[in-house]
Interface confidence: low
């Protein structure tokens, strides 16, 4: 429906405090490097602009879209020439090149400090001082980091960081109570930002069709009691608000998200049983638990696919009819039936599916040829299950810390060109499958495992795509969405691989390692094994975990020392000399 | 504009005490957190302690809890660091500063005084 004024219809839906949430959400993700008060005084700008517009529709400008009046405001940032360079040349443009322009530049890794956690007494202190800019901030800096952050769920996770310092900075023991908080926001906003950032790459590399399918595969195993026409409906809606969010339309994805939600509640006797708790909840809890809510019970005596989609004579003349309602349907009863499989491999069978029917289709005996369609499932199926079998017994063996390090050593010789970082941050997300996963019964493991790995893999694409090094993570990251994670399974020692240089620096030490966190060292090491195993691609996992002990002792025993730095300069020596001895560097 | 001048700094002995002043200026000082921090030689910034607009509450860094005292004299604009027990590790240049800001890290602060412990 049209309104008179689109700022004035989203500020009168959201309320202001969503409104200004959200504009300054929006304004950090395409400014990533500006300050928090610049940020802040355009979002006050715009916010008392929209008032005027409230207040009467027909003002001066209050006709203008969205993307006009945020691009507009953008584009008024005096230092845009000298902080993004030619992301200022986006200001030229008129919408919706503009927008697109300013999307093109979104910096998934942008060159900004860690953020580092300040004692729990100051935290409390600015949160006391001023709990509007303390919250503010912390919209802020997530949203710059991650320019592709879910907007609507972003409020939620706020609203769970204000009620952490709310309830921590009155308790006998502030940091007992606040930080496990912060750790836990913490690792589920990051894996929030990286699931959202699969939802974008989809959308925006392979097109709605792909998020759509995906969409349908993943309804259907959650609802599968919903008729294929309702999960239909909720894939439409889905993809029209993630559509919006990856695009930077955040008012309008929130605003529409929001009635998502409100249809779902208003009609779960027709969807699931499992979200009568989530529609009690306010609205930011409400959405957010219906995203995550548990599979439904799949209905009783489901006949079999084979009488719709082989057996039936009708197979060719309704995939003719309509292509992809067909292809939905199949996709939709086989995902319902199959809460066990991953996403992706559903939408491999559908692929796979279509494939033989685009073939048979045109063959003199369509029926013949399309037979035995289901037995090509078979590997297809058997491939990650006896993947993840390997995997989970390898990580029951050696730990989450070794199981991370044998991935590492994987990766590093599959593409060694890589930045290091990269491939130590990608290894060890992959490496936390076996803690998130295995500990499932059969029946939840693949699903848990190979869509985790999909979003993992897809950090590496989106962060690869920013600096290309190697062609083998290209192909495999465009070639086919559904078949990443497979491609690079499949990828074997790069044999092209000219080994780098040594370099001494690389593998000097000093005291500083002592005072780390074990995240932190274990990082250094990490960083080190990945190094080592570019100057010798070709060591075995003997000698790698020969020298990856012998590096272990020597940090603990100059931890121990009384000087340390001498011990770390001198020892350090020696192991980098044993260690090219070992490698035969 | 904005100033922060910090004094008493100096030579104490181990065991010793000395009282900092901060006088500050060009802002609003009763609506603003202030803190003290330092920085030892060759070391990074530590915070040291930290106090709410109103006088309390205030916190302190674990290194100095029981032997520091910070406070402040909201009518004369001036913040104050009381240091008893002193140790060589305290030695340091101490800077007086405005909280909080934008990223989490100090507005705006003085010069700095230093400190030195040593017998």
């Known amino acids: 429906d049209a309104h008179k004024s689109e700022v004035a219809h989203r500020f009168k839906d959201l309320g202001e405090e969503n409104f200004k949430a959200l504009v300054l959400i929006a304004f950090a993700q395409y400014l990533q490097q500006c300050p928090f008060e610049d940020h802040v005084k355009l979002v006050n700008e715009v916010t008392e602009f929209a008032k005027t517009c409230v207040a009467d529709e027909s003002a001066e400008n209050c006709d203008k879209s969205l993307h006009t009046l945020f691009g507009d405001k953008l584009c008024t940032v005096a230092t845009l020439r000298e902080t993004y360079g030619e992301m200022a040349d986006c200001c030229a443009k008129q919408e919706p090149e503009r927008n697109e322009c300013f999307l093109q530049h979104k910096d998934d890794n942008p060159n900004l400090p860690r953020l580092v956690r300040p004692e729990v007494d100051v935290m409390c202190t600015a949160f006391h001082d001023n709990e509007e800019t303390f919250l503010k901030k912390y919209l802020y800096e997530i949203a710059r980091r991650h320019p592709y952050f879910y907007a609507p769920e972003l409020l939620f996770f706020a609203k769970r960081y204000k009620a952490a310092f709310t309830e921590c900075c009155q308790a006998a023991d502030k940091a007992a109570c606040l930080l496990p908080k912060l750790d836990e926001l913490r690792d589920e906003g990051k894996a929030s930002s990286a699931k959202q950032r699969l939802k974008c790459a989809s959308l925006q590399k392979f097109g709605e069709r792909a998020f759509k399918a995906w969409a349908v595969a993943r309804l259907s195993q959650r609802f599968p009691k919903a008729e294929f026409a309702e999960v239909s409906k909720l894939v439409t809606d889905l993809t029209k608000v993630h559509t919006e969010c990856c695009h930077g339309d955040l008012l309008e994805c929130a605003d529409d998200r929001a009635d998502l939600a409100k249809y779902i509640c208003e009609n779960q006797d027709s969807i699931s049983s499992k979200l009568k708790e989530c529609c009690e909840k306010p609205l930011l809890e409400k959405s957010h638990c219906i995203a995550e809510v548990e599979n439904d019970e799949m209905p009783a005596d489901l006949p079999s696919l084979a009488a719709d989609f082989v057996e039936s004579k009708d197979v060719c003349k309704n995939y003719a009819e309509a292509k992809d309602v067909f292809l939905g349907m199949f996709l939709y009863e086989y995902a319902r039936r199959h809460p066990d499989y991953s996403v992706v491999l559903l939408l491999r069978l559908a692929k796979t599916y279509e494939t033989t029917l685009e073939k048979c289709c045109a063959a003199a005996d369509p029926h013949e040829c399309y037979a035995k369609v289901f037995d090509e499932f078979k590997p297809l199926v058997e491939e990650p299950q006896n993947l993840i079998k390997q995997n989970c017994e390898l990580f029951e063996q050696l730990g989450e810390y070794k199981f991370q390090n044998a991935l590492l050593v994987r990766y590093t010789k599959k593409v060694p060109q890589v930045s290091t970082p990269t491939l130590v941050e990608v290894s060890r997300n992959l490496g936390k499958v076996g803690s998130k996963c295995c500990k499932h019964p059969e029946a939840k493991r693949m699903p848990c495992a190979e869509d985790y790995l999909s979003v993992v893999l897809n950090q590496l694409c989106v962060l690869h795509e920013k600096t290309p090094v190697s062609d083998r993570v290209t192909k495999c990251c465009t070639e086919s969405l559904v078949n990443r994670r497979p491609c690079f399974s499949a990828l074997e020692v790069d044999e092209t691989y000219v080994p780098k240089e040594f370099n001494a620096e690389t593998f000097t030490f000093h005291a500083d390692i002592c005072t780390l966190s074990e995240k932190e060292r274990q990082i250094k090491k990490q960083t080190a094994l990945v190094e080592l195993v570019k100057h010798k691609p070709k060591a075995t996992k003997e000698q790698l975990k020969a020298v990856m002990d012998d590096f272990a002792a020597f940090v603990e025993k100059c931890c121990k020392a009384d000087d340390k730095e001498t011990c770390f300069a001198e020892e350090g020596k020696k192991l980098v000399a044993a260690s090219q001895a070992a490698l035969g560097l | 504009e904005v100033q922060l001048l910090e004094s008493g700094g100096g030579v104490v002995q181990p065991g010793g005490s000395l009282r900092l002043s901060c006088a500050a200026s060009?802002?609003?000082?009763?609506?603003?957190?202030m803190l003290w921090v330092r920085q030892a030689p060759g070391k990074g910034l530590e915070w040291v302690s930290v106090?709410?607009?109103?006088?309390?509450?205030?916190y302190y860094a674990d290194s100095v809890k029981g032997r520091f005292t910070i406070s402040r004299d909201n009518s004369k604009n001036t913040l104050y660091l009381q240091m008893n027990s002193l140790r060589a590790e305290d030695t340091a240049v101490y800077y007086c500063?405005?909280?909080?800001?934008?990223?989490?890290?100090?507005?705006?602060w003085g010069q700095g005084t230093l400190v030195q412990v040593s017998s």
């Open positions: 500063a405005k909280f909080p800001s934008s990223r989490m890290k100090f507005d705006y």
């Open positions: 060009g802002f609003t000082f009763d609506t603003s957190s």
């Open positions: 106090i709410h607009q109103s006088g309390t509450p205030t």
